[in-house]
């Protein structure tokens, strides 16, 4: 995909871009494309929006194939209609402490963000807002039909839940790392980001990793067992190779993915880890990218699209990254 060959564009006319997205020439100066936005994957052929001061951050020089659209150093953030300077910390609500860094916002929860799964002593956990309190708390609803509890108990399993990393102090540095953001795609390859100062210079930096919550082609609802409403972590029958902009992972992976529900709940990664994956491109180039691997998923009603500007995002975030 280098720029030395003759320019030829897709047969269809120039794309119509969503409002606020620039129509730009690709990185080869060949074809008109919709510019990639902050946090999206970018390539030489899929450039970032220059009118928003974005550039394609390829990470290490050896990985000049696929990058992430990143704001130039010092770019401000627009969050909830307010502009924040790069490096500025603010409380988006009583629940979140946020930091703006080069156009990206990373937030730490001030409330416990655990996902509580059913257990014998609390078969129907539910988060409720208590009067005069900022943080929601778990309550245990009584089952409507007591007979459910007996035979169904075997299906319950107490899950380890992890909140944000505990605050650490290291050599005059208050180490803080935000949670990994939700995967940018609900299916297929996306990216997830976080902000941390866990480095030698104690400087805030953005980190990103590839993520795949579930493959797009999988028809997961078919696998839901009779009488059940969810499939939390469907079994993937065969090892798969990941694809990224024409490049293929060198190894095959028996990865776990999150399932679906038929009752309005959404299933999202609960415990994850981050591992390097090597991709081989058609021209023989090999690049290494960090990628999220799912350990467990949780199905819950805290789906995106709720009223809280940040909460709807946050409940889709990854807990307890083991990397």
């Amino acid at each position: 995909q280098n720029c030395s060959g003759p320019c030829r564009c897709p047969d269809e006319p120039a794309p119509r871009c969503p409002a606020g997205v620039s129509l730009v020439l690709d990185g080869c100066g060949c074809c008109r494309v919709c510019a990639k936005q902050l946090g999206e994957l970018c390539t030489e052929r899929d450039p970032c929006d220059p009118h928003k001061g974005l550039f394609c951050d390829f990470g290490s020089p050896a990985n000049r194939k696929i990058g992430v659209c990143t704001a130039k150093d010092g770019a401000p953030c627009i969050f909830g209609g307010t502009v924040y300077r790069s490096g500025e910390s603010f409380q988006s609500s009583c629940k979140y402490q946020c930091t703006c860094l080069d156009g990206a916002v990373g937030c730490m929860p001030l409330c416990s963000m655990d996902v509580r799964l059913p257990s014998p002593d609390c078969p129907f956990p539910r988060r409720v807002k208590l009067p005069g309190k900022c943080c929601e708390e778990w309550v245990c609803d009584e089952p409507k039909d007591q007979t459910v509890v007996g035979p169904a108990l075997a299906a319950y399993r107490l899950e380890d839940t992890f909140g944000p990393d505990p605050t650490m102090i290291r050599a005059n540095c208050l180490v803080q790392t935000t949670e990994w953001s939700a995967c940018s795609k609900t299916c297929g390859m996306g990216i997830s980001t976080r902000v941390t100062n866990d480095n030698a210079s104690c400087r805030l930096e953005k980190q990103s990793r590839l993520c795949m919550v579930r493959p797009c082609e999988a028809d997961l609802e078919e696998n839901i067992k009779k009488g059940k409403k969810c499939i939390r972590t469907p079994k993937i029958s065969k090892p798969i190779k990941f694809e990224l902009s024409g490049c293929t992972s060198m190894k095959t992976y028996r990865a776990k993915f999150c399932g679906v529900c038929t009752d309005g709940r959404c299933c999202t990664p609960h415990r994850t880890t981050t591992l390097p994956v090597e991709f081989k491109c058609p021209d023989g180039e090999v690049m290494k990218k960090n990628m999220m691997f799912i350990k467990t998923c949780a199905c819950h009603y805290n789906c995106p699209g709720d009223n809280d500007i940040f909460e709807s995002l946050y409940y889709r975030k990854m807990y307890g990254d083991m990397a």
Epitope: G5, C7, R8, C9, P13, L25
Partner: antibody, heavy 119, light 111 residues
Framework: EVQLVESGGGLVQPGGSLRLSCAAS????????MAWVRQAPGKGLEWVAN????????DLLESLKSRFTISRDNAKNSVYLQMNSLRAEDTAVYYC????????????WGAGTTVTVSS | VVMTQTPLSLSVSLGDQASISCKSS???????????LEWYLQKPGQSPQLLIY???SRASGVPDRFSGSGSGTDFTLKISRVEAEDLGVYYC?????????FGQGTKLEIK
């Protein structure tokens, strides 16, 4: 009606310069690449250069890169070929052509302008 | 990429079929997977006109008696029933690699 009209050809001495122009009409000029193709007397067609929508990318026949330049002015619906250090072998009819940049290359051609390099 | 046409001249009776071959010195598959092989006709005293693009797609207004085929390095233009207006020089062209190149041309004459 879609039309391309070339001008600027003529007789020039070896080492001299010429600037060919091509005026386009009947279509949205900035939505198309443009190109120059030449044909020496009694010979076949030879691609010379093409230029993208806004002029930010140009591609030329390698052997002509040091002497020829293609440019465009979308406000004037025109494309140009600046030819310097002309040689006898540059004698040809120069055609301006519209390049779709998608499925096909040269879907519309001008009538051509003749360039003669001779002392 | 060198484009070699055969024959260089062709004399055909009206209503007969004509066939022109074009061979490329290497594969002309573009990096996007498409093959940009085109055919142009230059009638006497006129500018060239596009007949076929991407091996087998007919350009707008081109009669269906013109057809293109082939793959890899071997391509063919067929005129199923030659008419008087078809005379002229036919050029194949590749747009998949730099430099963009034309064949040397095949002159079609009417017997």
């Amino acid at each position: 009606e879609v039309q391309l009209v070339e001008s600027g050809g003529g007789l020039v001495q070896p080492g001299g310069s010429l600037r060919l122009s091509c005026a386009a009409s009947g279509f949205t000029f900035s939505d198309y690449y443009m190109a120059w193709v030449r044909q020496a007397p009694g010979k076949g067609l030879e691609w010379v250069a093409n230029i993208n929508y806004d002029g930010s990318r140009t591609d030329l026949l390698e052997s002509l890169k040091s002497r020829f330049t293609i440019s465009r002015d979308n406000a004037k619906n025109s494309v140009y070929l600046q030819m310097n250090s002309l040689r006898a072998e540059d004698t040809a009819v120069y055609y301006c052509a519209r390049d779709t940049s998608r499925g096909s290359y040269f879907d519309v051609w001008g009538a051509g302008t003749t360039v003669t390099v001779s002392s | 990429v060198v484009m070699t046409q055969t024959p260089l001249s062709l004399s055909v009776s009206l209503g007969d079929q004509a066939s022109i071959s074009c061979k490329s010195s290497q594969s002309i598959v573009h990096y996007n997977g498409n093959t940009y092989l085109e055919w142009y006709l230059q009638k006497p005293g006129q500018s060239p006109q596009l007949l076929i693009y991407k091996v087998s797609s007919r350009a707008s207004g081109v009669p269906d008696r013109f057809s293109g085929s082939g793959s890899g390095t071997d391509f063919t233009l067929k005129i199923s029933r030659v008419e008087a207006e078809d005379l002229g020089v036919y050029y194949c062209f590749q747009g998949s690699h730099f430099p963009l190149t034309f064949g040397q041309g095949t002159k079609l004459e009417i017997k």
